[in-house]
Amino acid sequence: QLPPGKPEIFKCRSPNKETFTCWWRPGTDGGLPTNYSLTYHREGETLMHECPDYITGGPNSCHFGKQYTSMWRTYVMMVNATNQMGSSFSDELYVDVTYIVQPDPPLELTVEVKQPEDRKPYLWMKWSPPTLIDLKTGWFTLLYEIRLKPEKAAEWETHFAGQQTEFKILSLHPGQKYLVQVRCKPDHGYWSAWSPATFIQIPSDFIMNDHHHHHH
């Protein structure tokens, strides 16, 4: 029987910069029941606080609700693991909420085959940013990535769309049914999950184009 091993806070995420959650990995348990507590202070403070919510984020987590989340101040936190034989502490972790945002997937993905009379046909898609993300403040730049594949294919083809919320793809296999998805990430945050798949049937008379794709 030993004191617990050193825990590690390995992940912090915010869906929208208004709340966030951090998760830790326990070290070895020393063969005894172990209690974990997360304490933190904000930059410029000396007063330590305990995690406000150990429940919402699941096991080995700390959730900071709206009233505990500030974008303006860095959080300095550590986890303490304690059993009957002693304690161990994680390394201190510094968290700036701006840089842990993992948004929800983009919304309202629509995909259409466009067949203009004077030009080659193309696949056109558009989407909306996730609702929880406030892009009007200016500091929040969302980047988008699209992936698509014929329904029965194994490999996805991915395209980086930058900040655009529309995209054209010019080279597709006629007669195939395609799955299309989009995801987003803030410039310094994390990729969202992929949006639910949208299906599109490519007409048999769709003419393959020499060019592969381009931004709209």
């Epitope: 590690e8 390995f10 410029g44 510094y94 700036d96 840089y99 994390y190």
Partner: antibody
């Protein structure tokens, strides 16, 4: 404890390439961005770019685009920077650094001295 | 790119004195999220830089309280009260508000 291990030195020929390594230990490699910084002898520091090991997403200083390529090998918890078409201007110490969940970095490797010489 | 100008380039001090280093940026370092990402590093001979102060005035873990940072916008100062021998080296300011991140040219703190 957190460590970023870099080889001490590399001697390379002009016109060739070199791939510098930065082996991370003591933490979950995919959690934090890795930065690369150049320091020429007796001079200041220049930020080259950064990479997110979780998905290999990169941001580069425009000045080093085409010169530096950042990659990671998640299986060995190692970050790499390849420098191409080397000239004497590329002779410098190159540091890797690790951020927290922040945009500044507190942990640095010991640096690799790259000497470009025929 | 944001240019960081440090003064003085060299700062001779006697042990126990106060030292003050100035850093000026070519544009405001207030991020659109309201934070100011101005940091100070110390590089001792033959070593990699070590973080002293993050976001203008916050001491990093383990940094003695004789180090303090202040300033706003484009003008920033690092003060060292009662300089000790272990404080000697080159001090760099750095900004991470704007990409690319940039550093000052350094201030060498040396014994008078």
């Amino acid at each position: 404890q957190v460590q970023l291990q870099q080889p001490g030195a590399e001697l390379v020929m002009p016109g060739t390439s070199v791939k510098l390594s930065c082996k991370a230990s003591g933490y979950t490699f995919t959690s934090y961005w890795i930065h690369w910084v150049k320091q020429r002898p007796g001079q200041g520091l220049e930020w080259i770019g950064e990479i997110d090991p979780s998905d290999s997403y990169t941001n580069y200083n425009q000045k080093f685009k085409g010169k530096a390529t950042l990659t990671v090998d998640r299986s060995s918890s190692t970050a790499y920077m390849q420098l191409s078409s080397l000239t004497s201007e590329d002779s410098a110490v190159y540091y890797c650094g690790r951020s927290f969940f922040t945009n500044w970095f507190a942990y640095w490797g010991q640096g690799t001295l790259v000497t470009v010489s025929a | 790119d944001v240019v960081m100008t440090q003064t003085p380039l060299s700062l001779p001090v006697s042990l126990g004195d106060q030292a003050s280093i100035s850093c000026r940026s070519s544009q405001s370092l207030v991020h659109s999220n309201g934070n100011t990402y101005l940091h100070w590093y110390l590089q001792k001979p033959g070593q990699s830089p070590k973080l002293l102060i993050y976001k203008v005035s916050n001491r990093f873990s383990g940094v003695p309280d004789r180090f303090s940072g202040s300033g706003s916008g484009t003008d920033f100062t690092l003060k060292i009260n009662r300089v000790e021998a272990e404080d000697l080296g080159v001090y760099f300011c750095s900004q991470s508000t704007h990409v690319p991140f940039t550093f000052g040219s350094g201030t060498k703190l040396e014994i008078k």
